[in-house]
């Protein structure tokens, strides 16, 4: 059962796992949610009736029954982890805590103009978990405007004390705001020789990499595969760090793989969600329950629905035993990973999918692409919306993309002559325009946010956000697309598609069924040669075939140029302008979304 409200002046008795320090009860709840075993917590707020050494303590708790006895205690705030909830969760914490000093290892001290600059510095420093900034009112003259970057083993402060005229806050890496490089390469036959901060068991290098990514101290990892010669080290995932933030060297070893934490690009890749099944593999751990199940998929569902289950092993039924049902072993451990992994015993293992909601919804796998043909099928492009105007009569105006549960990203030029958001309707989950009737549900638009440097499509800044009046409930037919990561500017996208209900040729009409076309990206240099009379800036991106024939056209404007990278779809472009449609040597020009990520985040995350 999902309980989101906090219980004031209430303490949960017993069930303690560990104690951490957090600046607020709200953040204590987030820490509890991300902890592999925590189901409940008790936070102690600052209070004259409470011993100051206990202020800001966040006691993480577990219980077999998923609840604990409640005791009245002033200044105590208790609550439940969001593990029990189905809604999206995020570790992103932008709050600034006034007059609080969050203690940790002060490894970097420098002058900063503001707390915001200090937070940015922390976000762009590979080691930084949180910071404390002495404001210009700070009593000690030599400490004024000093920005202290801090880290700890756990990523949370070792203590929090009251201190006038300072502010503290957390790194915004988990908000996808870091400018650090995102190194996605996995290095085969490679060991990184630096210091190990932890080790866990993992079934493959990808799970090892994801564990590294959400471990606060891990910067890179080495994984020993099941073919590793030393039996005791097989499936071992070594979580590593170094002073420089990079491995000091690489050593060649067969059957080992190494890679990097993806903490600075984690918004657009699944990090917590290990959705694969591992055949002929047994995960060992503390047994929670043994249940009969028809298949390994059914076993995974049972694990996902059991809040304390972290991973499972399914043993298929022997011949016609037990109505063809196998045994589903639901398991857990102290760190969420198997204590040992065994091969060759015939089991099928995997992880709970409960943690998938901690990843951005946009990373969820969608229906496989339908190859060939130009008409889309339902659920193929679940982020695509049709934007209608009701004035003077209702009609399709532009495309758009869902990027958040209240946000649509589209082109600024769509709103020429649109006086008010009241005349706009956003329809999601639509395949055919003919589905839209009088009674078809839609989202009203609360606000149109056009980039303030926009003048006309051809001169750039052709980007706009629509804030919806109500939130979108994500389903298979309507869900967001990931924004590209700023750390991914170097990525070459090779699987890009443009979609829309627009014209199929220059003189045509809006199409009934959502159309799709796979289109290669064109370098800006090449594009500039094709548009001598225009300036193709780095804030634009071009796509098209040299011979023409496939392109976006009138009515597709504002819609997505979607590119698949590392199994995740990214909104690389917004359909903006072009010379004619699908003309030879006239690529389509799109707004280069990666260049506007800061603008998007600034507008969508404004308080």
């Amino acid at each position: 059962e999902c309980v989101t409200q906090l219980l004031k002046d209430t303490c949960f008795e017993g069930g303690d796992i560990t104690t951490v320090f957090t600046p607020s009860a709200k953040y204590c709840q987030v820490v509890c949610t991300y902890h592999p075993r925590c189901l409940l917590f008790t936070f102690t707020a600052e209070s004259p009736s409470e011993d100051p050494t206990r202020w800001f303590t966040c006691v993480l708790k577990d219980s077999v029954t998923e609840t604990l006895p409640r005791v009245n205690r002033t200044a105590a705030i208790s609550g439940y982890s969001f593990k029990q909830c189905s809604h999206q969760i995020s570790a992103c914490n932008k709050d600034i805590y006034v007059d609080l000093d969050m203690k940790g290892i002060n490894y970097n001290s420098s002058v900063a103009k503001s707390a915001q600059e200090c937070q940015e510095r922390c976000t762009d420093d590979v080691h930084c978990h949180f910071f404390t900034y002495a404001t210009r009112q700070f009593p000690s003259l030599e400490h004024r405007n000093i920005c202290l970057l801090k880290h700890t083993q756990t990523g949370t402060p070792t203590r929090i004390t009251k201190l006038d005229k300072v502010v503290s806050g957390f790194s915004l890496k988990s908000c996808a705001l870091s400018n650090l490089a995102c190194i996605r390469d996995i290095f085969p036959n490679t060991v990184f020789a630096d210091s190990n901060i932890d080790s866990v068991m993992a079934p493959d290098a990808f799970v090892c990499g994801r564990i590294c990514t959400h471990h606060p101290g891990c910067l890179f990892f080495t994984f020993f595969s099941q073919e590793w010669p030393k039996e005791s080290q097989r499936n071992l995932c070594l979580l590593k760090t170094s002073e420089s933030g990079l491995p000091s060297t690489r050593i060649k070893k067969s059957k080992a793989l190494s890679g990097f934490s993806l903490q600075s690009c984690r918004h657009s890749i699944p990090v917590f969600c290990h959705s694969s099944f591992y055949h002929d593999t047994d995960f060992l751990g503390e047994e929670l329950d043994i249940v009969a199940a028809k298949s390994h998929e059914a076993c995974q569902k049972l694990c996902t629905n059991a809040v304390r289950c972290q991973f499972f092993t399914y043993t298929p039924a022997q011949a016609s035993c037990n109505e063809g049902k196998g045994k589903c072993y639901l398991k857990l451990s102290s760190n969420g990973s198997p204590t040992k992994i065994l091969h060759g015993r015939g089991g099928i293992s995997g992880y709970t999918l409960r943690l998938c909601k901690m990843d951005n919804e946009c990373t969820t796998k969608i229906k496989p692409r339908i190859v060939g043909g130009t008409a889309s099928v339902r659920g193929e492009w679940p982020w695509q919306v049709t934007l209608h105007t009701t004035s003077p009569t209702q009609r399709h105006l532009c495309g758009g993309s869902i990027i958040g549960n209240q946000w649509i990203l589209t082109a600024a030029h769509c709103f020429y002559g649109v006086e008010s958001p009241k005349i706009l309707r956003v329809y999601s989950g639509i395949l055919n325009q003919s589905e839209i009737k009088e009674d078809t549900s839609f989202f009203g638009v609360q606000e149109i946010i056009i980039h303030d440097q926009y003048k006309m499509a051809e001169s750039g800044y052709d980007i706009a956000l629509l804030k919806l009046e109500t939130t979108v409930n994500y389903t298979d037919s309507q869900r967001p697309i990931c924004l590209p990561s700023k750390g991914d500017r170097n990525v070459i996208y090779t699987d890009c598609w443009v979609t829309g209900w627009g014209y199929r040729k220059l003189r045509d009409k809006i199409q009934n069924t959502l159309q799709k076309a796979k289109i290669p990206l064109v370098t800006n240099e090449e594009c500039q040669k094709r548009y001598r009379g225009h300036k193709i800036t780095h804030k634009m991106i071009c796509a098209g075939y040299r011979e023409g024939g496939k392109d976006a056209c009138k009515g597709d404007s504002g819609g997505p140029l979607s590119c698949k990278h590392n199994e995740v779809w990214h909104l690389v472009g917004i359909t903006s302008w072009g010379e004619g449609c699908a003309q030879r040597e006239r690529p389509g020009v799109y707004t280069n979304v990666v260049e506007y990520v800061d603008w998007i985040l600034e507008k969508t995350q404004a308080v």
Partner: antibody, heavy 118, light 107 residues
Framework: EVQLLESGGGLVQPGGSLRLSCAAS????????MAWVRQAPGKGLEWVSS????????LYADSVKGRFTISRDNSKNTLYLQMNSLRAEDTAVYYC???????????WGQGTLVTVSS | DIQMTQSPSSVSASVGDRVTITCRAS??????LAWYQQKPGKAPKLLIY???TLQSGVPSRFSGSGSGTDFTLTINSLQPENFATYYC?????????FGQGTRLEIK
Amino acid sequence: EVQLLESGGGLVQPGGSLRLSCAASGFTFSDYEMAWVRQAPGKGLEWVSSIVPSGGWTLYADSVKGRFTISRDNSKNTLYLQMNSLRAEDTAVYYCATWGDSWGFDFWGQGTLVTVSS
Amino acid sequence: DIQMTQSPSSVSASVGDRVTITCRASQGISSWLAWYQQKPGKAPKLLIYDASTLQSGVPSRFSGSGSGTDFTLTINSLQPENFATYYCQQADSFPIAFGQGTRLEIK
């Protein structure tokens, strides 16, 4: 067919700078780790620097650390070596090469000569 | 850092001969060694990796052996096109190091 074509070499004074480029074709450049290897006149081979496919991690020989910067532009299929504070001992033919899973330099360019002399 | 020493620094042989070049690492490098051939004015060419695995397209008269610190490159039945300089390279860890080279010339 894999092709690597270096350019940008030439005569430069000690303390000066030079930027080498290596244009790649015939393979998926963004999938490969790349490197620069040099060879002083009449001498052996010396590894200079490497860069991972994403460009996010670079490695350097001690002899060039702090003076040379390797980079790549995957959209242009091009590898670069920015050489600053050049010394006479940096005089060499500079080769661009692909670094394979075998931990060997699979393919090489034809090289570009850099001469540092006053 | 690992240093590589090749011997001899030069060797004279005739067409049809069998030639052996050795390479020694300053510390154990398992079987992580590569061999290259370089002709005057040309770029090096990878011949062998992992001490004994022939790179595709390389004639079978080239063979490599060894592990730990001592390695050899053997060329059976020398052909005119085999006269060149040969380099070994440790592929155990960064920084990557090459041997100083062995010049194979016609007797």
